[in-house]
């Protein structure tokens, strides 16, 4: 049937409308045309549409299809990016609690050691922090350097203070004798275990969100291919040419184009939904040594444990040092000789999982039940796309790229757009490099979750043990187990409120214990002071 | 005998750069951390930041922070300080220190005049 | 602007006693050792006193620290001519760094 002729045979209403696209009306024709140079639009009859004017059409569509792509990925993107943000804030919010733990342990129990004890303190947990955002760095070669730098400053000042002056330069043989003698028993080991696991996870944890954002930030702002431009025009605005201004596409005809344009981009959906999915089995295990926040935050109770471990020991390892390293003893060890040994507790020190705060755990749970939500996000965006964009209801006129019709099926439309333009063409090129460069590193992270999602079981370290590890504290749990004896001075008594805390960060006066005068009961405090309270910015 | 050499003295214009180097002989260089304090003329002494020369591990002070880079050559047992951004207030003495066992800094080099001047 | 803070000149005459004063916070000389430097006219600075009151070898006993809350002082007894010199106090601060005072120059009359 042929079309209905433009209502305005003066293509005025056309050039109204084509005018707020493009000022001025040089391109317009004033009357209907034949059309005959129209690549997009082709007309069955007179049309008001120019060369020019299809050309701009097509630019239009490709930037309306921008828009509409990055307004459809806008929650998920800000919902990335707020936690990824959160999130490192959070981790270094927990590196520099721990820090400051293990500066108050050392301040209250082990004067003598400080300040060198500070910079060793300082160094590790600086490496820990540049660990986490995914510097180049060993974890054992950090923990073997903090154990190093102790044990020199532990023998003069503490084991052996009565050394002079000119004995003090045994220190290298002093760091060379803390390994060959392992002086510090298994707990350098236990330590580098824990970190290593925990650093491990948090850094993956963090690479993935970061990822998330640039798989979205690839997809945002992807640039439409010139045939998708075609039938976008041809979608969008061909009606126009006809003079008919108010029609909307065909639903089913819109879906059909945008999976044409998004073929590329629904390539993702299948890694999309890994990605999310062993992102959740990464988060489900981040618990115990698999906790950076459990883990650091006990690390003060550990490092404590390791020195009274060398103290247990000072009188034999005094003896055999003197002889490697070539100076003469000058005071047998006593154990009450500095006040160092006073604030001893052997109560055991576990950080507790109160599962009615927010902590870093439950917002973790949380973001993961969110992401779910966004788990069909690429397969969905066609339709997402079309219901928001205008559309025609199913029991109304359509346009379905060609003409009005009264409802809109594939078949008519493949009959309506023979030797125009091929969809199964366009969807048979495949997705963008920039596309396929991205579901590359879906594919690489998703490996990497894959791999260090944790064994569900109590398989866990259990070579701990067999390696003779002398902290009867722990039972037989190992993974369970954040150091041994607590310090007596320091107790953790719940996990940080992060998200209350991220309103107003604590500086070392605030970590438990700060005082050298301080008694044993004086320092059961909690580990913050009373935080319940405090706004979260995050909710 | 334990001693540390310091590079000579240097005159610099504002927005340059200077390297000062701090040379370690008489003990094991890679086992103890090496400070940086300055002293401009006739003022107290500010202590710029540390290097774990075994590491290569770095501590800055807050004020010097993005404007200073403390480095180590292990294999000749020298540590080096740089400052960048250079202003007429960073004329001053600069110094190595190591920090000994004890927690002082119990070995300081002879000191090195930096002159920023345009 | 230093951070702790000692006079900027003292003096008495030789064979009396001297004490310099050092005044901190509770995060510096409050929770922390405080060490003291002599430093020569012309020379770098030479440890004097370290850990609150504790002397390295070589150093007089006319020389002695204490410390008592956020406050240290040197007591120099038996003052002699060589003594002439400035004398900075020294403490690790909780922000993370090394503080020292403005220094006290001290002139043996």
């Known amino acids: 049937q042929p079309p209905p002729p433009p209502p305005d045979a003066t293509c005025h209403q056309v050039r109204s409308f084509f005018q707020r696209l493009q000022p001025g009306l040089k391109w317009v024709p004033e009357t209907p045309v034949p059309g005959s140079d129209l690549q997009v639009c082709l007309p069955k009859g007179p049309t008001c549409c120019s060369r020019k004017m299809e050309e701009k059409y097509q630019l239009t569509a490709r930037l309306n299809m921008e828009q509409l792509l990055q307004s459809a990925s806008m929650e998920l993107k800000f919902l990335i990016i707020q936690n990824a943000a959160v999130f490192q804030e959070a981790f270094e919010i927990v590196v520099r609690h721990a820090k400051n733990y293990t500066n108050a342990m050392f301040k209250n129990n082990y004067p003598s050691l400080t300040p060198q004890a500070f910079e060793f303190v300082g160094e590790f947990f600086t490496d820990v922090s540049l660990y986490i955002l995914g510097s180049d760095i060993n974890v054992d070669d950090m923990v073997n350097e903090l154990f190093d730098s102790l044990f020199p400053v532990i023998y003069t000042q503490l084991m052996n203070p009565g050394l002079p002056d000119s004995a003090l330069d045994i220190n290298e043989c002093l760091r060379g004798a803390r390994r060959d003698l392992k002086v510090f028993g298994n707990f350098p080991k236990l330590i580098m275990t824990q970190v290593s696991k925990s650093l491990q996870v948090t850094r993956i944890f963090l690479q993935a969100l970061n990822l998330g954002i640039e798989v979205i930030n690839t997809t945002d702002h992807l640039k439409f291919s010139k045939d998708c431009g075609r039938m976008l025009t041809r979608m969008w605005y061909c009606s126009y040419c006809q003079g008919l201004m108010m029609v909307k596409p065909c639903g089913g005809y819109c879906n059909v184009v945008m999976q044409g344009c998004m073929a590329g981009v629904v390539e993702i959906d299948k890694y999309w939904r890994e990605y999310i999915l062993s992102l959740e089995e990464l988060v489900n295990g981040m618990y115990r040594i698999y906790d950076m926040e459990n883990v650091l935050l006990g690390l003060f109770s550990t490092i404590h444990d390791s020195i009274q471990y060398v103290q247990k020991n000072a009188g034999k390892l005094t003896t055999t040092i003197g002889k490697l390293c070539a100076h003469s003893q000058q005071r047998q060890y006593r154990s009450a000789y500095y006040p160092e040994d006073l604030f001893i507790d052997k109560k055991v020190l576990k950080v507790a999982h109160v599962e009615h705060e927010e902590t870093l755990s439950s917002r973790r749970r949380e973001l993961i039940q969110k992401l779910k939500s966004f788990i069909s996000f690429y397969s969905a965006l066609p339709g997402y796309i079309c219901s928001h964009s205008p559309v025609a209801e199913n029991d109304t006129l359509c346009w379905n790229g060609q003409e009005l019709v009264e409802r809109y099926s594939q078949k008519a439309a493949r009959n309506g757009m023979k030797n125009q333009f091929n969809l199964h063409e366009l969807k048979m090129k495949g997705p963008e490099p920039v596309v396929s460069q991205i579901i590359d590193k879906l594919k690489h992270i998703n490996q990497l979750l894959r791999t260090m999602s944790m064994p569900k079981g109590r398989v866990l370290d259990k070579n701990l043990d067999e390696e003779g590890f002398e902290s009867g504290d722990c039972g037989d749990d190992e993974d369970e187990c954040i150091g041994g004896s607590g310090d007596g001075m320091i107790k953790v008594k719940n996990q940080l409120r992060f998200l209350a805390e991220l309103a107003y960060d604590l500086d070392v006066d605030d970590a438990p214990g700060n005082s050298q005068q301080a008694t044993p009961k004086d320092n059961e405090i909690s580990t913050f002071h009373n935080l319940g309270n405090v706004h979260s910015p995050l909710k | 005998q334990m001693q540390l050499v310091q590079s000579g003295a240097e005159v610099k214009k504002p927005g340059a750069s200077v390297k000062v180097s701090c040379k370690a002989s008489?003990?094991?260089?890679?086992?103890?951390?090496m400070h940086w304090v300055r002293q401009a003329p006739g003022q107290g002494l500010e202590w710029m930041g540390w290097?774990?020369?075994?590491?290569?591990?770095?501590n800055y002070a807050q004020k010097f922070q993005g404007r200073v880079t403390m480095t180590r050559d292990t294999s000749i047992s020298t540590a080096y300080m740089e400052l960048s951004r250079l202003r007429s207030d960073d004329t001053a003495v600069y110094y190595c220190?190591?920090?000994?066992?004890?927690?002082?800094?119990?070995?300081w080099g002879q000191g090195t005049l930096v002159t920023v001047s345009s | 602007q230093s951070v702790l803070t000692q006079p900027p000149s003292a003096s008495e005459t030789p064979g009396q006693k001297v004490t310099i004063s050092c005044s901190g916070s509770?995060?510096?000389?409050?929770?922390?050792?405080v060490f003291w430097y002599q430093q020569l006219p012309g020379t770098a600075p030479k440890l004097l006193i370290y850990?609150?009151?504790l002397r390295p070898s070589g150093v007089p006993d006319r020389f002695s620290g204490s410390k008592s809350g956020t406050s240290a002082s040197l007591a120099i007894s038996g003052l002699r001519s060589e003594d002439e010199a400035d004398y900075y106090c020294?403490?690790?601060?909780?922000?993370?760094?090394?503080?020292f005072g403005g220094g006290t120059k001290l002139t043996v009359l």
């Open positions: 220190a190591r920090r000994g066992l004890r927690g002082d800094f119990d070995y």
């Open positions: 020294a403490a690790w601060d909780d922000s993370l760094s090394w503080v």
């Open positions: 509770s995060s510096n000389i409050g929770t922390n050792h």
């Open positions: 850990r609150n009151n």
């Open positions: 290097i774990n020369p075994n590491s290569g591990g770095t």
């Open positions: 008489g003990y094991t260089f890679t086992g103890y951390y």
